[in-house]
Interface confidence: medium
């Protein structure tokens, strides 16, 4: 599939003060419950070997995993923020649903797989950590996709 402009998010998604605040509050609440400070999910390692033009596709993969396997199973926690942030991130995920890349995505899949395995290995505390890094997810989506 060709690289296309569908790997784009409107900057306006990231300029809504209310939902930005709720996203960061959710991350803050979860990070207070995260006692594993040695592990970072969204950091330099996640982007290693991935060109700048492919980083939005990478973040799409991370966003979908976070929604499917972290936020929805944990959707009872960290209210009222979770209730508002999940539909917002779902909207971003929908906007990126036609985002594909051409060529080799081996590095991307390897890096995403490592993130998933880390979360799974840590169990529930891995999910809490992922929620605690929603601010990083938010900023990385903005940097990579706008």
């Amino acid at each position: 599939l060709p690289v296309n402009t569908r790997c784009k998010l409107e900057v306006s998604n990231f300029q809504q003060p209310y939902i930005v605040n709720r996203t960061f509050m959710l991350a803050k609440e979860a990070s207070l419950a995260d006692n594993n400070t040695d592990v970072r999910l969204i950091g330099e390692k996640l982007f290693r070997g991935v060109s700048a033009k492919d980083q939005c596709y990478l973040m799409k993969q991370v966003l979908n995993f976070t929604l499917e396997d972290v936020l929805l199973p944990q959707s009872d926690r960290f209210q009222p923020y979770m209730q508002e942030v999940v539909p917002f991130l779902t909207k971003l995920s929908n906007q990126l649903s036609s985002c594909h890349i051409s060529g080799d995505d081996q590095n991307i899949q390897k890096n995403v797989r490592r993130l998933k395995e880390t979360v799974k290995k840590l169990g529930e505390s891995g999910e809490i950590k992922a929620i605690g890094e929603l601010d990083l997810l938010f900023m990385s989506l903005r940097n990579a996709c706008v």
Epitope: E68, L72, P73, S75, P80, V86, P87, T90, K91, N94
Partner: antibody
Framework: EVQLLESGGGLVQPGGSLRLSCAAS????????MSWVRQAPGKGLEWVST????????YHADSVKGRLTISRDNSKNTLYLEMNSLRVEDTAVYYC?????????????????WGQGTLVTVSS | EIVMTQSPAILSVSPGERATLSCRAS??????LAWFQQKPGQAPRLLIY???KRATGTPARFSGSGSGTDFTLTISSLEPEDFAVYFC??????????FGQGTKLEIK
């Protein structure tokens, strides 16, 4: 056997109220989100409302917001739909369905179990 | 709201033949698409989820395909018990599930 059994439907006048119940058995009710879906006579399916596993968050379709309220009592394995200010267009069979949840093996993500439905008729 | 459109509204096929039902989404739903079967007076029953995965108890003659906005449910060789109404449903826009209007599969 995994089962959902709705009750509480009936005939009600416009502006009236009803409370639907859905009794769950055969699975760990408290670990699953639950939804209500309705079907007007001879029509398609319409999502009405969803509640997360412990009831911490609820979501409603715009068409019912402020009038229909989903709730649950995990100690009784029961899901509820409180219906107020009912309109003729709310006439439908209301189904409860097992939704998002986590098992030991996987995250279940679809409406995989449905009740038999209860008919709500709003008419003067 | 994501609008789901099914075609045809009514499909007449003979037992033993192949049936192909279509579902189109107004915007991409990735692979978050399910198919339900409903018989008169009964609740819907989940047949296919995530576009192509068969739910527990779904016979192998049912298969799903597609991605993005265009999806297909195929029944390879129709059995008498397969004549029913079929609905597609997206869960991409969680929890605002939307369903297609249904395709009635009837005996030719």
């Amino acid at each position: 056997e995994v089962q959902l059994l709705e009750s509480g439907g009936g005939l009600v006048q416009p502006g009236g109220s009803l409370r639907l119940s859905c009794a769950a058995s055969g699975f760990t009710f408290s670990t699953y989100a639950m939804s209500w879906v309705r079907q007007a006579p001879g029509k398609g399916l319409e999502w009405v409302s969803t509640i997360t596993s412990s009831g911490g968050a609820t979501y409603h379709a715009d068409s019912v917001k402020g009038r229909l309220t989903i709730s649950r009592d995990n100690s009784k394995n029961t899901l509820y739909l409180e219906m107020n200010s009912l309109r003729v267009e709310d006439t439908a069979v209301y189904y409860c369905a097992k939704d998002w949840g986590r098992t030991v093996y996987a995250v279940i993500k679809d409406l995989d179990i449905w009740g038999q439905g209860t008919l709500v008729t709003v008419s003067s | 709201e994501i609008v789901m459109t099914q075609s045809p509204a009514i499909l007449s096929v003979s037992p033993g033949e192949r049936a192909t039902l279509s579902c189109r989404a107004s915007q991409s739903v990735s692979n978050y698409l399910a198919w339900f079967q409903q018989k008169p007076g009964q609740a819907p029953r989940l047949l296919i989820y995530d576009t192509s995965k068969r739910a527990t108890g779904t016979p192998a003659r049912f298969s799903g395909s597609g991605s993005g906005t265009d999806f297909t449910l195929t029944i390879s060789s129709l059995e008498p018990e397969d004549f029913a109404v079929y609905f597609c449903q997206q869960r991409s826009d969680w929890p605002q599930y939307t369903f297609g209007q249904g395709t009635k599969l009837e005996i030719k």
